[in-house]
Structure formats: structure tokens, C-alpha cells
């Protein structure tokens, strides 16, 4: 069984969050994928999504968020550039597959952005600031407007208990039953 986990990223304003969400490529290579924020007590909010069907290695930009789906490698790359304190929150990658419920990809990311510019990109402690130039081919995709009434209605509190699920992705149905999520620093 796979544990539903949360990773805590502590970054400074101006830095870049640069993460990967891996998925079962045989199942989801061309499925539309999205980057969501889960605010306490609210439904997940989709901030950006890939095209439908998702195009291979084709950057999609929505504001300061860039998504790039590498089908061959079963990886979605998510970059949030020029981070601001207000970007702090809990994030997740999901796969849309209507009419089914969306699937959430591990791991969730607890982003904490603090004031005080440090010249470090992403999680690298001693390197120079990363300035991302968005490729001219970047497109903006339309994301599904619906959020299933059965999906997350409350962000899980930080805790240390494990939640197991039999597959690499978790179906978001009845996630309100999930009470605790381990936090790994």
C-alpha cells in the first residue's frame, strides 16, 4: 500500500517551486492534469491545467505557474516562479478523467513562503536565483470548471498517522474520511 503523504517546502519570496508529480503512464499519459490548492475548509481550487488531451512536453503557463507533462516518463513538472508569501498553502496534482472522479497524485506539497529574499532557487540551498524564461510556445489551457461535490471539502490537518491506499493514485471520492496526513520535512 502507498501512503498518502505531504512534503513541506520552506522557500523564500522570489524563489521557484519546481516539483514533479509522477503517475502511471500506461493509465494516464494523455489525460488532462491540473495543479490545485487546497485552502482550509474549502474545495480544491484548480490553478492551472494541461490541455485536453495533454500534449507531450508542451509547456502550459497560467500566470506564474508552468506545467509540463512528459508522457514518456510519466511525469508532470510543475513550476511556480517568483513565489509570494500569499502562495503558501497545500497543493496537489490531480488527473481529470470525466465522468469519473479526479485522481490525486502523490505527494501533496505544503508550501510555506516566507519574507526575506534569499538567492536560492527551489530547494537548492547555495545557488543563485533561478530566472525562468517561459518558452514562446507556451499555451494556456482551459480547465474544467466543475469540482465534484464529493471531493475534498476540508484540508486534512497536519499530523503523523499514515493513510494507505492500494495504488499509486488515490481517487478523491470521500477524501473527507481521511483525517491525518504525515508531514515530512
Amino acid at each position: 500500500a502507498t501512503k498518502l503523504t505531504e512534503e513541506k517546502y520552506e522557500l523564500k519570496e522570489g524563489q521557484t517551486l519546481d516539483v514533479k508529480c509522477d503517475y502511471t503512464l500506461e493509465k494516464f499519459a494523455s489525460s488532462q492534469k491540473a495543479w490545485q490548492i487546497i485552502r482550509d475548509g474549502e474545495m480544491p481550487k484548480t490553478l492551472a491545467c494541461t490541455e485536453r488531451p495533454s500534449k507531450n512536453s508542451h509547456p502550459v503557463q497560467v500566470g506564474r505557474i508552468i506545467l509540463e507533462d512528459y508522457h514518456d516518463h510519466g511525469l508532470l513538472r510543475v513550476r511556480m516562479v517568483n513565489l509570494q508569501v500569499e502562495d503558501s498553502g497545500l497543493y496537489q496534482c490531480v488527473i481529470y478523467q470525466p465522468p469519473k472522479e479526479p485522481h490525486m497524485l502523490f505527494d501533496r506539497i505544503r508550501l510555506v513562503v516566507t519574507k526575506g529574499f534569499s538567492g536560492t532557487p527551489g530547494s537548492n540551498e547555495n545557488s543563485t536565483q533561478n530566472v525562468y524564461k517561459i518558452p514562446p510556445t507556451t499555451t494556456k489551457a482551459l480547465c474544467p470548471l466543475y469540482t465534484s461535490p464529493r471531493t475534498v471539502t476540508q484540508a486534512p490537518p497536519k499530523s503523523t498517522a499514515d493513510v494507505s491506499t492500494p495504488d499509486s493514485e488515490i481517487n478523491l471520492t470521500n477524501v473527507t474520511d481521511i483525517i491525518r496526513v504525515p508531514v515530512f520535512n
Epitope: T5, Y9, C21, S57, R79, S123, N124, S127, K133, S168
Partner: antibody, heavy 124, light 107 residues
Framework: QVQLVQSGAEVKKPGASVKVSCKAS????????INWVRQATGQGLEWMGW????????GYVKKFQGRVTMTRDTSISTAYMELSSLRSEDTAVYYC?????????????????WGRGTLVTVSS | DTQMTQSPSSLSASEGDRVTITCQAS??????LNWYQEKPGKAPKLLIY???NLETGVPSRFSGSGSGTDYTFTISSLQPEDIATYYC?????????FGGGTKVEIK
């Protein structure tokens, strides 16, 4: 001691398959992705793909798709790379390498720990 | 795929010399570049990650710099134990790709 120990050299005929093993010790096997890189004699390094030992998810470079399979046995902290339909140009040293990342899901592809390599010779 | 052009392919320098190797990417890789050292019969060893960060335990005579598509690896004072082949590796885009390598010898 933190290390990756690979299986011994193999000699195979064209068309056959080879399965190389990579046993991890000294660290939590499921916490780091395993990648496979090969080096043909006198040639440079070539990435073949990656595997998440925790979930078993994999990704393969296009040129190897359909011929390569990366698997693992978490009970013995071992990763495997199987390459089928071997041809002479697959003669190479095959390395397993650990992807180190400050955060599990960060886009960092630093290979900080390597096996000693397994020489696979394909010859009729 | 992102092509990595590494130069020179080989070089010979004297002990104590400053040695510079360059790697040029076919597209912007956003500093997502590592440098490895490979000695005959041994596995590659990570020296520099994310263009300019020195891996723990690696001597400070090794350094890296660059941005965009152009990156440089420097050995400030060549030592006999530095005889090896050096490779750059990009991860700005998938698939990961390596430079062709630079073989460093001592005169």
C-alpha cells in the same frame, strides 16, 4: 555503508534478454528514485529511465520503450532493469544510480550514488 | 531532446594549471545542470549540481558557473588525482542528456 551493488557481467546472444539487478543498502530504498544509465565502450553516458521504488512507477527514454522494463522488490531493496531484443549496439556497462533530492518530489536529477556497473556483452 | 555539446573532447595540462570545460545546451536549461567525474573502471561521481553547487566532500578547486544555454566547469589547480573524464548532464528538460565528455590528462 550506503551503496548500490549490481549483479555480475553477462554475455548474451542477439535477440536475447538480460536482467540486471541493483541492491541498495545503508539507506531507505523506497525513499529515492532509481535511474539506469548506460555507457557503451568508449562512448558517453546515456540515460535510460527512472523508477519510483515506493510505488513502482516508471518512465523510459523513447528509444528504449518497448524493450526496457524497470521493476523492484522492496522486500530485498533491489531494483531490476530488463532489456529485451538485444543487439550488438546494446553492449555496454549498465549503471543504476540513486536520484538524490532535498525533497522527494522536487525536480532535482542529481545522481549522488552509483552502482559499480554491469558489463553486458551482446555477441553471436 | 536537449543536445549537450561539451568541449574540448580532451585536454592535456600541467599540474597546478587552471582547467576549463564548457557545455552548451541546445535550449535554455535554467541552470539545471550537473557535472560528474568518471575514472577508468569506476562509477561516475557527482561534483557539481544545479550549475554551481559543490557536492559535499568535493574539493573546493572544482567549481561550476553559467546560465541559460552556456555552462563552465573549472578546476582551479589541476592535481594528479583529477585525471579523469568529466561529463555535464542537463535536467532542464526530459529526457536527461549528457555531454560527450572531456578527457583530462596531465602533461
Amino acid at each position: 555503508q550506503v551503496q548500490l551493488v549490481q549483479s555480475g557481467a553477462e554475455v548474451k546472444k542477439p535477440g536475447a534478454s538480460v536482467k540486471v539487478s541493483c541492491k541498495a543498502s545503508g539507506y531507505t530504498f523506497t525513499s529515492y528514485d532509481i535511474n539506469w544509465v548506460r555507457q557503451a565502450t568508449g562512448q558517453g553516458l546515456e540515460w535510460m529511465g527512472w523508477m519510483n521504488p515506493n510505488r513502482g512507477n516508471t518512465g523510459y527514454v523513447k528509444k528504449f520503450q518497448g524493450r526496457v522494463t524497470m521493476t523492484r522488490d522492496t522486500s530485498i531493496s533491489t531494483a531490476y532493469m530488463e532489456l529485451s531484443s538485444l543487439r550488438s549496439e546494446d553492449t555496454a556497462v549498465y549503471y543504476c544510480a540513486r536520484r538524490r533530492a532535498v525533497y522527494r518530489s522536487s525536480w532535482e536529477w542529481y545522481f549522488d550514488l552509483w552502482g559499480r556497473g554491469t558489463l553486458v556483452t551482446v555477441s553471436s | 531532446d536537449t543536445q549537450m555539446t561539451q568541449s574540448p573532447s580532451s585536454l592535456s595540462a600541467s599540474e597546478g594549471d587552471r582547467v576549463t570545460i564548457t557545455c552548451q545546451a541546445s535550449q535554455d536549461i535554467f541552470n539545471d545542470l550537473n557535472w560528474y567525474q568518471e575514472k577508468p573502471g569506476k562509477a561516475p561521481k557527482l561534483l557539481i549540481y544545479h550549475a554551481s553547487n559543490l557536492e559535499t566532500g568535493v574539493p573546493s578547486r572544482f567549481s561550476g558557473s553559467g546560465s541559460g544555454t552556456d555552462y563552465t566547469f573549472t578546476i582551479s589547480s589541476l592535481q594528479p588525482e583529477d585525471i579523469a573524464t568529466y561529463y555535464c548532464q542537463q535536467y532542464g528538460n526530459l529526457p536527461l542528456t549528457f555531454g560527450g565528455g572531456t578527457k583530462v590528462e596531465i602533461k
